[in-house]
């Protein structure tokens, strides 16, 4: 079974990279960041 710690770790692993990719897209497309 996947531990709660591992799930939190996996979530944390991707969230800044998701924000990063979203912001790069925002700079190009000028979509609202909220």
């Amino acid at each position: 079974a996947v531990s709660e710690h591992q799930l939190l770790h996996d979530k944390g692993k991707s969230i800044q990279d998701l924000r990063r990719r979203f912001f790069l897209h925002h700079l190009i497309a000028e979509i609202h960041t909220a």
Epitope: H9, G12, D17, I28
Partner: antibody, heavy 118, light 116 residues
């Protein structure tokens, strides 16, 4: 190929203003966010400002917020940095940089030197 | 806050390999970073972005002698078959968006000397 050429640097007295320009070529300028990054003599890099493709969104660190203004003229393929109330600590080489879909500062110019001194 | 730490200097022999380290502040250990190269008297050049899992994408014209890897809060740039033109400052950087504000910080850089 992507080319970014900065200009407008020089010697300026504290408290005065200066406007830098960055002429872009080799790509569709209006399609990308652009930034300014500076480097004080013998020091590290410092992000200064970022602007979205159409100019609707701008971002600054606290160190320059309220004094510096980034803007762009997409019809002239030119990026600007208006610097007001200049201080000695603003002395640096100023680089413009272009983003890609993958990263913030993918392409850089050769820089223009700004010296703030009385 | 978001901080990147780099050793000020490193050296390795021509043809050898070198591994440069960039360490993220502990609470930001999962972050994707970027590596830049700055040769003497030149503007910076984008080398790669490097994710927490070690995957990376390199910039235009960067030879495949440059590779990246990660372990915990550490991000590594490995240069193999060192050449004289690899002598440069290597700087890591990281960005984030917090409450609709963008923040980007650079490490202090590592000056790489290639011994001939």
């Amino acid at each position: 190929q992507v080319q970014l050429v900065e200009s407008g640097g020089g010697v300026v007295q504290p408290g005065r203003s200066l406007r830098l320009s960055c002429a872009a070529s080799g790509f569709t300028f209006s399609s990308y966010g652009m930034s300014w990054v500076r480097q004080a003599p013998g020091k590290g890099l410092e992000w200064v400002a970022t602007i979205s493709s159409g100019g609707s969104y701008t971002y600054y660190p606290d160190s320059v917020k309220g004094r510096f203004t980034i803007s762009r003229d997409n019809s002239k393929n030119t990026l600007y940095l208006q610097m007001n109330s200049l201080r000695a600590e603003d002395t640096a080489v100023y680089y413009c940089a272009r983003q890609t879909t993958m990263t913030y500062f993918a392409y850089w110019g050769q820089g223009t030197l700004v010296t703030v001194s009385s | 806050q978001l901080v990147l730490t780099q050793s000020p200097s490193a050296s390795a022999s021509l043809g050898a390999s070198v591994k440069l380290t960039c360490t993220l502040s502990s609470q930001h250990s999962t972050y994707t970073i970027e590596w830049y190269q700055q040769q003497p008297e030149k503007g910076p050049r984008y080398v790669m972005d490097l994710k927490q899992d070690g995957s990376h994408s390199t910039g235009d014209g960067i030879p495949d002698r440059f590779s990246g890897s990660s372990s915990g809060a550490e991000r590594y740039l490995t240069i193999s078959s060192l050449q004289s033109e690899d002598e440069a400052d290597y700087i890591c950087g990281v960005g984030d968006t917090i409450k609709e504000q963008f923040v980007y910080v650079f490490g202090g850089g590592t000056k790489l000397t290639v011994l001939g």
